[in-house]
């Protein structure tokens, strides 16, 4: 296409020195269209009489000759007004003007649709000097026209601060229809009407549209572009395209697939990412979405224990990120897990069920009847308790954790003992005398540490006291017993 710019072209000098070759007195007539040898473009000349100056933009020079005769008005000569040609063909057109020799530095520039054109390889200016005037022919050529070359071309000449403008030359590039809007692929609901749009332009106009569905024409009579096809509804996938016809021939749009929305396929590859005592993290690969985006997914969980009541827990989640943590499960239990996802049409079938297990849980109950008493002879605190009633799912008891906090006027410290599961008593060394010792005990399984028992406090006197009664877990409602005798 043509380079467009708004800056001034470099002026051609009016007398550029000796012309290449000899000056011809019988030079080409001013309104001929010089062509490359052998090239005959299709031209449509305007009906204006050749050779006569037009009455458009005319400059009346104020300068007079030696004989004081006023100079004639300056104007571009009429040339062809409208050129029609096919895409990719070449074209050459020109402007011509005779300029009195008294003018120097005349500039001719080409303009298209109001913008100056630059590109010396397109424009050539030739000078034919005579005694009083110089004939100037400005030619413009395009080797392979495109649709973007369509438009109105003019020549402009600046002379004596006046601007002379030629009549426009309209270039019309014709070709096969060109699509400005093609039908788009769509996903539609079964038996629901939808529209497809097709628009194409020339020149030449008019452009007529035929619609094609699965290789068969839909409309017997063409419609003028633009055309909207209303499809009353489909029951199965179809491919649509449109044909655009003009006098130059036919262009076919891309074929677009119209899909029928359906329920999704079930998810696949449900897998266990992580398991804890009370939760299972699962992931899945979504199935085919049925040409409609997934909205959400449902995780179905049922106890795999044959003795369970068979009830199904349902957890709803968003479709992304194909990951869900199932919570509030029993410890050390087996579950069957399936995933189903939905789109606007409905729910998929459930994925293949997978088996998953939770791990051992921490004990849910603290040791009972905690009793603490001071054994002065050995300077120890003896602690006794009852094993908590553990549920099967809490896992196997592996031991106990004993927290003992020592508080006196000068110190406060907490120590932690971990003891094995055998027996239900422990002995800890007295850390501080004249202090309060607060004891808490928790049961431990491989699943974790259970809750601590309620605190039991005992006062450890200074050395020399005689009798010590035990402290024990308070009865409900009595907090912080301190039994000192």
């Amino acid at each position: 296409a043509i380079t467009e710019a708004r800056e001034e072209a470099k002026p051609y000098p009016l007398f550029p020195g000796p012309f290449p070759g000899s000056l011809q007195t019988d030079h080409t007539p001013l309104l001929s269209l010089p062509h490359a040898s052998g090239y005959q473009p299709a031209l449509m000349f305007s009906p204006t009489q050749p050779g006569r100056p037009h009455t458009g933009n005319v400059a009346i020079p104020q300068v007079t000759s030696v004989e004081s005769k006023p100079l004639p008005p300056l104007a571009f000569k009429h040339t062809v007004g409208h050129i029609i040609l096919s895409e990719h063909k070449g074209v050459k057109f020109n402007c011509s003007i005779s300029v009195p020799n008294i003018y120097q530095d005349t500039t001719i520039s080409w303009w298209k649709d109001g913008k100056e054109l630059l590109g010396a390889h397109h424009a050539i200016t030739q000078f034919y000097p005579d005694d009083e005037v110089t004939a100037i022919i400005a030619s413009f050529s395009i080797t392979s026209v495109q649709r973007s070359d369509n438009g109105s071309y003019i020549c402009k000449m600046k002379i004596n601060n006046e601007e002379i403008v030629s009549d426009p030359i309209y270039i019309e590039v014709q070709g096969l229809p060109h699509f400005t809007k093609q039908p788009e692929s769509m996903n539609v609901t079964r038996n629901t009407a939808f529209n497809l749009t097709c628009q194409a332009v020339g020149p030449p106009e008019p452009v007529n549209i035929f619609w094609v569905q699965n290789s068969s024409r839909v409309n017997e009579q063409p419609e003028k572009s633009p055309s909207v096809l209303t499809v009353p509804g489909l029951t199965e996938m179809a491919v649509f395209s449109c044909e655009a016809h003009n006098d130059k021939g036919l262009t076919v749009s891309k074929g677009v697939q119209i899909n029928i929305k359906a329920i999704p396929s079930p998810p696949t590859e449900v897998s266990i990412r992580n398991s804890t005592a009370h939760s299972i993290l699962i992931s899945w690969v979504p199935g085919f979405d049925g040409y409609s985006p997934f909205r959400n997914c449902s995780i179905q969980v049922k106890e795999a224990d044959p003795l369970s009541n068979g009830s199904v827990m349902i957890f709803n989640t968003s479709a992304l990120p194909h990951l869900y943590q199932i919570k509030q499960l029993q410890a050390l239990a087996n579950y069957s897990i399936g995933v189903s996802c939905m789109n606007e049409i409905g729910w998929s079938a459930v994925s293949p069920w997978i088996l998953a297990s939770t791990t051992e849980g921490a004990p849910s109950v603290a040791p009972l009847n905690v009793t603490v008493f001071l054994n002065e002879s050995s300077d120890n605190v003896d602690i006794r308790w009852m094993k908590p009633p553990t549920k099967q799912q809490d896992g196997e008891l592996v031991g106990y954790r004993i927290s003992h906090v020592w508080q006196s006027a000068g110190i406060s410290k907490e120590l932690l003992e971990e003891v094995g599961q055998n027996g239900s008593r422990a002995r800890i060394s007295v850390q501080v005398h004249n202090a309060t010792c607060t004891v808490r005990i928790a049961a431990v399984t491989r699943g974790g540490v259970g809750p601590f028992s309620d605190p039991v406090k005992i006062f450890i006197p200074a050395h020399g006291w005689v009798d010590y009664a035990p402290s024990s877990t308070p009865a409900p409602g009595n907090a912080d017993p301190v039994l000192i005798i």
Partner: antibody
Framework: QVQLRQSGPGLVQPSQSLSITCTVS????????LHWVRQSPGKGLEWLGV???????DYNAAFISRLSIIKDNSRSQVFFKMNSLQADDTAIYYC????????????WGQGTSVTVSS | QIVLTQSPPIMSAFLGERVTMTCTAS???????LHWYRQMPGSSPKLWIY???NLASGVPARFSGSGSGTSYSLTISSMEAEDAATYYC?????????FGGGTKLEIK
């Protein structure tokens, strides 16, 4: 008086790890345990883990695979490290002393605001 | 894990008004391990009531706490301006230790 001072980065890249140091004064870590808790607009306050006075650690099962708490009693410092952070780990992270009486989190650090973003 | 549900999530009271907020546990919690924290905007939580009913150091006597099993409450006998804050209940009994979602108390 009892003080817990936290230091750590404000911005962490996704999949990277977070390290926060809690430096304590006014008490000894050999006598007291130290908890870590975080607070986010979406999930509220969440307990993450504890290091007891003797160095035993307990972690929230939801974080056990990517959490580590260690301490240096002589320097009065507890080091918290969480791996593989994602956007939903954006929160304010707190250290808090485990009291004796009250047997609760009785003193808290000032918090470290952590944003996980690339 | 034990879920603590606080209600109401947001409440407003006139100065001098009596205010009660509740905390319900999904499983039984020993009263020795149920605590309340108060948090002012931009600050860390602060221990406010421990072992269900004991006031932490420096807490005004107009605050009180009660409850057992799965139902606990915090009461302010006469609302004052400085009491506007968010209050969280916390169970330190069953691991993982959990917090309620908070009750935001505002002045009417």
């Amino acid at each position: 008086q009892v003080q817990l001072r936290q230091s750590g980065p404000g911005l962490v890249q996704p999949s990277q790890s977070l390290s926060i140091t809690c430096t304590v004064s006014g008490f000894s870590l050999s006598n007291y345990g130290l908890h870590w808790v975080r607070q986010s607009p979406g999930k509220g306050l969440e307990w993450l883990g504890v290091i007891w006075s003797g160095g035993i650690t307990d972690y929230n099962a939801a974080f056990i695979s990517r959490l580590s708490i260690i301490k240096d009693n002589s320097r009065s410092q507890v080091f918290f490290k969480m791996n593989s952070l994602q956007a939903d780990d954006t929160a304010i992270y707190y250290c808090a002393r485990k009291g004796h009486d009250p047997y609760a989190m009785d003193f808290w650090g000032q918090g470290t605001s952590v944003t996980v973003s690339s | 894990q034990i879920v603590l549900t606080q209600s109401p999530p947001i409440m407003s009271a006139f100065l001098g008004e009596r205010v009660t907020m509740t905390c319900t546990a999904s499983s039984s919690v020993s009263s020795s391990y149920l605590h309340w924290y108060r948090q002012m905007p931009g600050s860390s939580p602060k221990l406010w009531i421990y072992d269900t009913s004991n006031l932490a150091s420096g807490v005004p006597a107009r605050f009180s706490g009660s409850g057992s099993g799965t139902s606990y409450s915090l009461t302010i006998s006469s609302m004052e301006a400085e009491d506007a804050a968010t209050y969280y209940c916390h169970q330190y009994h069953h691991s993982p230790y959990t917090f309620g979602g908070g009750t935001k108390l505002e002045i009417k």
